[in-house]
């Protein structure tokens, strides 16, 4: 049970945590204009990764898209890739991950092979969470230079006589939005990965085999259930006694003799 | 066709208090902002205060902040300027004004008179 | 805040004659996000309350006839009327639509020879 329940959150938490990292790609506000210096400007600025805003008291906002490729910065199309290859990799590990889940029986898809899938999917979406987290880094990063850039020259004097105030950005919603999604995503590739772990059969092929320990006779049939009842002190076989977790996952997918009372 | 009609305008005492009202018709009300200017032969135009048009943000100009409120009553396409501690330098005539496109007034009321004498 | 300065103060000229008049302003009014200029002009008539003739330095607003031109770009903006006729005879204000408080400039004023 707590394998497919490690397995069932694992996926949940990278599917919030893509979900929010596809938001965060789309969101317009990676960067928004600083008002510390001018609390109740007329005209506020914010930048996405695929274009620009300026939304105006008035209630009227105007959006541009960087409609130039090669005109970009190299930095923020750095960050676009990593954040399209954390959506790529999430997506494909979500798809993965469906067909892994426990509680989904397609075909008589074998446990390796599920936990194979589980490790891939786990995998997957840890390196879709650490590209997203690295892409809203970078952005962060390149905002705190240019903030720090735009601050040391803010007022640059015409004559001394005219003021000509310089935009600062400051870090946008979609930055938070991105880190907490990136962190859920790399959380549930983890607990996928756990998950994977508690699947494997390890050199165990689950065949009807019966095995004999000193002074007690300990059957097993496929599932992992005793057919007897005494646990002797069978060490050579522990790891068909670390199913103490996965029988109480097997109750939900085989019959168990409590079934036929 | 939009529509902007101030009321309430008058004689008033110094230190005495005073409500304008500006009726809208012919558009949205509750999709715009909306602005309280005031015009006098000296000073000119003078913008006087801004409600947002979910009655958030509201900005007011120093001169008349913490003595004057701006509402607004979105069903009745009504705005309010409530003016109190009057002085003799708040004389002037008022006019309420839509905002638009370019943070502009694009339509404006013919506006009410307040004079304030002893 | 931001001060609006306008000249001259008086304009005095002849029917069909081409105008200019200036606004000047403490502070840039561009705006780096779109490369707006947030300046706008209003044209009176006496009696009568503003009206919108201009708003982001040079997009006339609908009903404006063309003879009406704005220009310029961060502190120096212009408004020219191309031809004058009877009924431009007004003051002209300019007006900082960049941040609050909105500020207006003092006026030009339209005046027949």
């Known amino acids: 049970m707590a394998v497919t329940a490690c397995q069932g959150l694992g996926f949940v938490v990278s599917l919030i945590g893509i979900a929010g990292i596809i938001a965060a790609t789309c969101m317009d506000q990676w960067s928004t204009q600083d008002l510390y210096n001018n609390p109740v400007t007329a005209v506020f600025n914010y930048q996405g990764l695929w274009r620009s805003c300026v939304r105006e008291s008035s209630g009227f906002t105007e959006c541009r898209g960087y409609f130039t490729l090669l005109g970009l910065p190299a930095m923020l199309q750095a960050v676009r890739a990593l954040m399209i290859v954390g959506i790529v990799l999430g997506a494909i590990g979500l798809l993965v991950s469906i067909f892994a889940l426990k509680c989904i029986r397609i075909g008589s898809m074998e446990d390796s092979a599920k936990a194979n899938m589980t490790l891939t999917s786990g995998i997957m979406f840890i390196v879709s969470g650490l590209c997203a987290i690295a892409g809203v880094s970078v952005f962060a990063n390149m905002l705190v230079t240019n903030f720090w850039m735009s601050t040391a020259n803010m007022y640059t004097g015409m004559g001394g006589m005219v003021q000509t105030v310089q935009t600062r950005y400051t870090f946008g919603a979609a930055l938070f939005v991105g880190w907490v999604a990136g962190g859920l995503t790399l959380i549930g590739g983890v607990m996928m990965c756990i998950a994977c772990r508690g699947l494997a059969p390890e050199e165990t092929n689950y065949k009807a085999v019966s095995y004999h320990a000193s002074g007690h006779s300990v059957a097993y049939k496929p599932g992992g259930f005793k057919a007897s009842t005494g646990f002797g002190s069978n060490t050579k076989n522990k790891k068909i006694y670390d199913g103490g977790a996965r029988t109480e996952d097997e109750v939900q997918s085989y019959p168990s003799k409590h079934d036929y009372v | 066709d939009v529509q902007l009609v101030e009321s309430g305008g008058g004689l008033v005492q110094p230190g005495g208090s005073r409500k304008l009202s500006c009726a809208a018709s012919g558009f949205t009300f509750s999709g715009f902002g909306v602005h309280w200017i005031r015009q006098t032969p000296e000073k000119g135009l003078e913008w006087v205060a801004y409600i947002g048009s979910g009655s958030r943000p509201i900005y007011y100009a120093d001169t008349v902040k913490g003595r004057f409120t701006i509402s607004r009553d979105n069903p009745k396409n009504t705005l309010f300027l409530q003016m109190t501690s009057l002085r003799s330098e708040d004389t002037a005539m008022y006019f309420c004004a839509r905002f638009y496109y370019g943070n502009s007034f694009d339509h404006w009321g013919q506006g009410t008179l307040v004079t304030v004498s002893a | 805040d931001i001060v609006m300065t306008q000249s001259p103060s008086f304009l005095t000229v002849t029917a069909g004659e081409k105008v200019t008049m200036n606004c000047r302003s403490s502070?840039?009014?561009?705006?780096?996000?779109?490369?707006?200029?947030?300046l706008t002009w209003y044209q009176q008539r006496p009696g009568q309350p503003p009206k919108l003739l201009i708003y982001?330095?040079?997009t006339r607003e609908s009903g404006v006839p063309d003879r009406f031109t704005g220009s310029g770009s961060g502190t120096d903006f212009t408004l020219t009327i191309s031809s004058v006729q009877a009924e431009d005879l007004a003051l002209y204000y300019c007006?900082?639509?960049?941040?609050?408080?909105?500020?207006f400039g003092a006026g030009t004023k339209l005046e027949l020879k």
């Open positions: 502070q840039s009014l561009l705006n780096s996000g779109n490369q707006k200029n947030y």
């Open positions: 982001w330095a040079s």
């Open positions: 007006q900082n639509a960049y941040s609050f408080p909105l500020t």
